[in-house]
């Protein structure tokens, strides 16, 4: 994906993220030279968070609320750089891109990983899922690959039908673009595919984190 805009407001932090940050700072003060065993540290953090009272968590929740307000305030005045329009128009009626075999696998096992390791960051959950997938024998991957292939087939039929009808957005604007070469089009679609999957996973994780905060 493109390089981030340095002027873009920093993303908002959850109450748990503030708590972990505080944990890290405490750990650094106590053991300035010690290297952190990430999984042990995450485990301890999440155990501590689970045993904390609502009153103790309150401080971090206040920090998260303040940070959310800061983020919303900054986003109101933030102007994205030229060419970085929020996202190219996506017709909500367009067929949804099919997930890859790995994405199907992740959807199946992400809840388990997140549930058993509540302190793991989104990146580390993804890393763990990647390890699980890589350690999976080829014949164990087959059901996911079969399902992904079926969904891809269905998508290709649906997208062909959708294109035959003509994109409503293009029709409205009267835009007539020369057909890109099939190869280029497919490459772009694959790239978009991966971006969509990553975005969907991030959105899912963010939603789940917010749900966790509500608990």
């Amino acid at each position: 994906m493109g390089k981030g805009d340095p002027k873009k407001p920093r993303g908002k932090m959850s109450s748990y993220a503030f708590f972990v940050q505080t944990c890290r700072e405490e750990h650094k003060k106590k053991h300035p030279d010690a290297s952190v065993n990430f999984s042990e540290f995450s485990k301890k953090c999440s155990e501590r968070w689970k045993t904390m009272s609502a009153k103790e968590k309150g401080k971090f929740e206040d920090m998260a609320k303040a940070d959310k307000a800061r983020y919303e305030r900054e986003m109101k005045t933030y102007i994205p750089p030229k060419g970085e329009t929020k996202k190219k128009f996506k017709d909500p009626n367009a067929p949804k891109r099919p997930p890859s075999a790995f994405f199907l696998f992740c959807s199946e096992y992400r809840p388990k990983i997140k549930g058993e390791h509540p302190g793991l960051s989104i990146g580390d959950v993804a890393k763990k899922l990647g390890e699980m997938w890589n350690n999976t024998a080829a014949d164990d991957k087959q059901p996911y690959e079969k399902k992904a292939a079926k969904l891809k087939e269905k998508y290709e039929k649906d997208i062909a039908a959708y294109r035959a009808k003509g994109k409503p957005d293009a029709a409205k604007k009267g835009v007539v673009k020369a057909e890109k070469s099939k190869k280029k089009k497919e490459e772009e679609e694959d790239e978009e595919d991966e971006e969509d999957e990553e975005e969907e996973e991030d959105e899912e994780d963010e939603d789940e984190e917010e749900d966790d905060d509500d608990e």
């Epitope: 809840p111 549930g115 058993e116 024998a137 164990d140």
Partner: antibody
Framework: EVQLLESGGGLVQPGGSLRLSCAAS????????MTWVRQAPGKGLEWVSS????????KYADSVKGRFTISRDNSKNTLYLQMNSLRAEDTAVYYC??????????WGKGTTVTVSS | DIQMTQSPGTLSLSPGEGATLSCRAS???????LAWYQQKPGQAPRLLIY???KRATGTPARFSGSGSGTDFTLSISSLEPEDFAVYYC???????????FGQGTKVEVK
């Protein structure tokens, strides 16, 4: 406390059907793969079938393929095994089991299925 | 399909003695997917060792697992009365699981 409780076993005639259930409690059922393992009298352990957390993916031992169907109802925290065209060799204690992190397996006490005329 | 063969079928030993149980796979398997179970009469199996050599929660230190490729071993350094049981090796495929068990080794009192 994590618990798995099998039920539905009994005496059935060859060619008959039976549906086993396994009620789970004490853990988030919808996160985990679930598995049926059986043990014929005086014999060893035999893996029967497994199902993924969402229920979207299943696997079967060759000996039961086409006759047994594994399913789950995550809203009821229950695992099922529908057994059709039962044979004498399906006589066994059927265990329901799941596996947590670090391979900590949890097993039920088992339910006995007897196929006999 | 991978077959798991255990030997001996029965092991007659006295408390305090050491025990060595063998498990052979019909083709090379990753140690990540090799486990050992203990089963006592009338009880469900209990996981002892996973990933060929890691002790599961609650497994006493006298139990140890080793091996790689096709040959794996479960060792009991000094048998306690509660260790007399049947032991199964297991090869596991995951997501969702598919398990292959050996036929078992019975450890009985001599």
């Amino acid at each position: 406390e994590v618990q798995l409780l099998e039920s539905g076993g009994g005496l059935v005639q060859p060619g008959g059907s039976l549906r086993l259930s396994c009620a789970a409690s004490g853990f988030t059922f919808s996160w985990y793969d679930m598995t049926w393992v059986r043990q014929a009298p005086g014999k060893g352990l035999e893996w029967v079938s497994s199902i993924s957390p969402s229920g979207g993916y299943t696997k079967y031992a060759d000996s039961v393929k086409g006759r047994f169907t594994i399913s789950r109802d995550n809203s009821k925290n229950t695992l099922y095994l529908q057994m059709n065209s039962l044979r004498a060799e399906d006589t066994a204690v059927y265990y329901c089991t799941t596996e947590f992190y670090d391979y900590l397996d949890v097993w039920g006490k088992g339910t006995t299925v007897t196929v006999s005329s | 399909d991978i077959q798991m063969t255990q030997s001996p079928g029965t092991l007659s030993l006295s408390p305090g003695e050491g025990a060595t149980l063998s498990c052979r796979a019909s083709q090379s398997v990753s140690s990540t997917y090799l486990a050992w179970y203990q089963q006592k009469p009338g009880q469900a199996p209990r996981l002892l060792i996973y990933e060929a050599s890691k002790r599961a929660t609650g497994t006493p230190a006298r139990f140890s697992g080793s091996g790689s490729g096709t040959d794996f071993t479960l060792s009991i350094s000094s048998l306690e009365p509660e260790d007399f049981a049947v032991y199964y090796c297991q090869h596991r495929h995951n997501w969702p699981p598919q398990w292959t068990f050996g036929q078992g080794t019975k450890v009985e009192v001599k």
